[in-house]
C-alpha cells in the first residue's frame, strides 16, 4: 500500500523525509487530544482510545527523519495541512496548533525555534 509520494528532491531534503514517514498517528493523537468525547475522526473511533499508542507510533515516525530536529517544522506543517479541512472552527484550529507545537516536547525532541503553522490558501 506504500507509494512513492510524488515530490522529488534528494533524500536528505526535509520535504522528501516528511513524505516518507507516516504522520497519521500524529494527526490522530492530536485530534484525540482536542476532540475528546466527540463522535468520530476519519473512520477510526477515538472516543475511548488511549492516546499513548498513537503517540508512541507518532514519535517513532518523527524519529525516523534523518534530520529530525531540522525537519520538525516541515513535519508539523504537513500535519496541519493534512488536517486543516477537518477543523470545524477557529477555536479548533487554535487548539490544534497549540497541541501541534507541544508534540516535539512530548516526543522528547526540541521544539523548532520558529515554525509558521499557517496553511496558505486555507482557514488555517
Amino acid at each position: 500500500m506504500r507509494r512513492e509520494r510524488g515530490r522529488q528532491g534528494d533524500s536528505s531534503s526535509c520535504e522528501r523525509q516528511v513524505d516518507r514517514v507516516n504522520l497519521k498517528p500524529c494527526e490522530q493523537h492530536i485530534m484525540q487530544r482536542i476532540m475528546g468525547e466527540q463522535e468520530q475522526y476519519d473512520s477510526y473511533d477515538i472516543r475511548s482510545t488511549r492516546s499513548s499508542d498513537q503517540q508512541q507510533r507518532c514519535c517513532d515516525e518523527l524519529n525516523e527523519m534523518e534530520n529530525t530536529q531540522r525537519c520538525m517544522c516541515e513535519a508539523l506543517q504537513q500535519i496541519m495541512e493534512n488536517q486543516c479541512d477537518r477543523l470545524q472552527d477557529r477555536q479548533m484550529v487554535q487548539q490544534f496548533k497549540r497541541e501541534l507545537m507541544n508534540l516535539p516536547q512530548q516526543c522528547n525532541f526540541r521544539a523548532p525555534q520558529r515554525c509558521d503553522l499557517d496553511v496558505s490558501g486555507g482557514r488555517c
Epitope: 500500500m1 507516516n22 497519521k24 498517528p25 473512520s43 473511533d45 525516523e64
Partner: antibody, heavy 122, light 108 residues
Amino acid sequence: QQLKESGGGLVKPGGSLKLCCKASGFTFSDYNMNWVRQAPGKGLEWIGSITRSSRTIYYADSVKGRFTLSRDNAQSTVCLQLNSLTAADTATYFCAREDFNVYTGPYYYDVWGPGTLVTVSS
Amino acid sequence: YVMMTQTPSSVSEAVGGTVTIYCRASQSVSNMFLVWYQQKPGQPPKLLIYGASTRATGVPSRFRGSGSGTQFTLTISGMKAEDVATYYCQQNGNSPYTFGGGTEVVVK
C-alpha cells in the same frame, strides 16, 4: 516481494544462535521489520521490531536482554541474535515486513518469511 | 502492556455458516492499530484485516472486521472449507505489540 529466514537449528541450553532474514523484490530500507515466533502447537508471539533507520528497536519482555535486533539496509538483511537460550525459546521464528496504509495510517505485516526452526535441547 | 484475549479458542461451523471470533484488549486500542491474521497449518500467517475493519488486498468480502475500544470482532459469513485455519488478532500501536491466543476454526 519475499523474505527468507536462515540460521535456525539445534542448540544447547545457554547457547547462542544468529538468525537472519534476507529480503528481495522491494526497497528494504522503506520498511520496519519485525520478528514473531511460534512454539510447536502454540500461538504467535511477537518478539521485536526495528524501524527503517534502526533508530527505534522494541523487544518483548520475554526476550529483553537476551535477544538483539539489527539490520543492514545495504544488504537488505535483518538479523536476530539469540543468547542465553532455554527450552522455552524452541519455536519457528518468522520475520515479517511491516507496512502502513499511506492514506489512513494503519500498520500491518504484509510479507512474511516461511520461518526457521530453532530447537533448544541438551 | 496490552493483553489481547481471543474467544472462543476453537469453533466448529458447517460450510455456509457464520463464524464470529472475539478479541478483547485489556486496555483501549485505537482501531488504527488492530489487525487480524489467518494462519493455515505449516504456513506463515497471512494478513486478513487491518485498521480493525479494512480487508487486505485479495481477501474475500465474507471476512468482516468490526469493533472499537477494547472489543473487536472478526466475522466469517458463508464459511468455506478453505477458511479452516487459526485466526489471530494483534494490537500494533503500543510496544510490546501483542497477539491474541488464536482461534482455531474447523468445519463441522
